[in-house]
C-alpha cells in the first residue's frame, strides 16, 4: 500500500477472475478509481472500475476471460495498481506484486442437491465452480447444518480434508427442516482463504414411522 491508511486486498479464483477490495480512510469522494492489472509474462492488461461497497471501501472484479479459461499459472506475477483520477491525471494509490496462486479464493460451491434423505440422515452432493485443474484433488471443504432454533454462527463445522463433493449428515431429527451450506479451499497458497459459503440448501427429514398398536 502507498500509505498506512490504505489496504488493498485481492484474490484469484484460480481461473479467470481477480477480485479486489481497496479501503482507505478519508478517501476522496466522487472520484473515479480503477484497478489495473499488468502481468509480467502475458500480452494482455486488464482494468476494472472500483465501485463503493461502504463509506471507505471499494471493490471490483478483473474479468480476465471466459469463466472457465485458465488465464494465469503458478509462475505468473501480476502487478496490481489502484489508480484514482485527479483532474486529468491518474494517481497511484496502492500497488502490489500479486502472486495469484498464493492468494486464492475459489467461487462458492454450486448445484447443491439432496441425493437421499431418511428420518435421521441425509446425503447431500455439490459441485465446485470455476476451479483450476491444477489443484487435481488438493482441495478441502467445510460444511455446516442449520438446525431449528439456532443460527449459522452456532452451527458446528464439519471438515472434509479431501476433495469429496458429498456428505452424509447423521443423527438428524425426524420430520425437521434443516439448511446446509458448504465452502471450499485449495491447500495451495500462503494467503489462500475459504470461498464464500454456498447458497443454503433447505431439506426436511422424513417423519418417523408410526408404531403399531399393541
Amino acid at each position: 500500500a502507498v500509505n498506512g491508511t490504505s489496504q488493498f486486498t485481492c484474490f484469484y479464483n484460480s481461473r479467470a477472475n481477480i477480485s479486489c477490495v481497496w479501503s482507505q480512510d478519508g478517501a476522496l469522494q466522487d472520484t473515479s478509481c480503477q484497478v489495473h492489472a499488468w502481468p509480467d509474462r502475458r500480452r494482455w492488461n486488464q482494468t476494472c472500475e472500483l465501485l463503493p461497497v461502504s463509506q471507505a471501501s471499494w471493490a471490483c472484479n478483473l474479468i480476465l476471460g471466459a469463466p472457465d479459461s485458465q488465464k494465469l499459472t503458478t509462475v505468473d506475477i501480476v502487478t496490481l495498481r489502484v489508480l484514482c483520477r485527479e483532474g486529468v491525471r491518474w494517481r497511484v494509490m496502492a500497488i502490489q506484486d500479486f502472486k495469484p496462486f498464493e492468494n486464492l479464493r475459489l467461487m462458492a460451491p454450486i448445484s447443491l442437491q439432496v441425493v437421499h434423505v431418511e428420518t435421521h440422515r441425509c446425503n447431500i452432493s455439490w459441485e465446485i465452480s470455476q476451479a483450476s485443474h491444477y489443484f487435481e484433488r488438493h482441495l478441502e471443504f467445510e460444511a455446516r447444518t442449520l438446525s431449528p432454533g439456532h443460527t449459522w454462527e452456532e452451527a458446528p463445522l464439519l471438515t472434509l480434508k479431501q476433495k469429496q463433493e458429498w456428505i452424509c449428515l447423521e443423527t438428524l431429527t425426524p420430520d425437521t427442516q434443516y439448511e446446509f451450506q458448504v465452502r471450499v479451499k485449495p491447500l495451495q497458497g500462503e494467503f489462500t482463504t475459504w470461498s464464500p459459503w454456498s447458497q443454503p440448501l433447505a431439506f426436511r427429514t422424513k417423519p418417523a414411522a408410526l408404531g403399531k398398536d399393541t
Epitope: 473515479s32 480503477q34 494482455w44 486488464q46 465501485l51 471490483c60 474479468i63 476471460g65 469463466p67 489508480l83
Partner: nanobody
C-alpha cells in the same frame, strides 16, 4: 476476442439526433472498456467518448460534451452513443472500439474495432 457491429447511422439535418448502437459478441462484454471514435474524410480517426466496464464513468472529447451521451447495457452486450444537436462537423464514419485496459482505450493501435457506421449531418 470480442467482435463489434455498429448500427444506427444515417443522414440527419443539423440540430437533429441519432442513436448509434454497437453490439458485441465473442467474449465476456464486461471485461471491456468501450469507446466511440470517428473519422471524417481526409482526417485522422479521433476519440469521441468512452465508458468504463461498469458504465459508471464516462469520458468525452471537448467538442461533443453536453451533446453526446455514451452508455452501455451489459445485459444486452451493447454500447450506445446518443447524439443530440448534431452539427455538420459531426459528419464522419463512427467506429466502436473495445479494450480490456481503460488506460489504452484512446490509443488507436491497441483497440478492437467495428466496421463503422456513416453519420452525415446536412446543413
Amino acid at each position: 476476442e470480442v467482435q463489434l457491429v455498429e448500427s444506427g447511422g444515417g443522414l440527419v439535418q443539423a440540430g437533429g439526433s441519432l442513436r448509434l448502437s454497437c453490439a458485441a459478441s465473442g467474449d465476456v462484454f464486461v471485461r471491456y472498456t468501450m469507446a466511440w471514435f470517428r473519422q471524417a474524410p481526409g482526417k485522422e480517426r479521433e476519440f469521441v467518448a468512452s465508458v468504463t466496464d461498469s458504465g459508471r464513468t464516462t469520458d468525452y472529447v471537448d467538442s461533443v460534451k453536453g451533446r453526446f451521451t455514451v452508455s452501455r447495457d451489459n445485459a444486452k452486450n451493447t454500447v450506445y452513443l446518443q447524439m443530440n444537436n448534431l452539427k455538420p462537423e459531426d459528419t464522419a464514419v463512427y467506429y466502436c472500439a473495445a479494450n480490456t485496459d481503460y488506460f489504452q482505450i484512446k490509443s488507436l493501435d491497441r483497440n478492437t474495432w467495428g466496421q463503422g457506421t456513416q453519420v452525415t449531418v446536412s446543413s
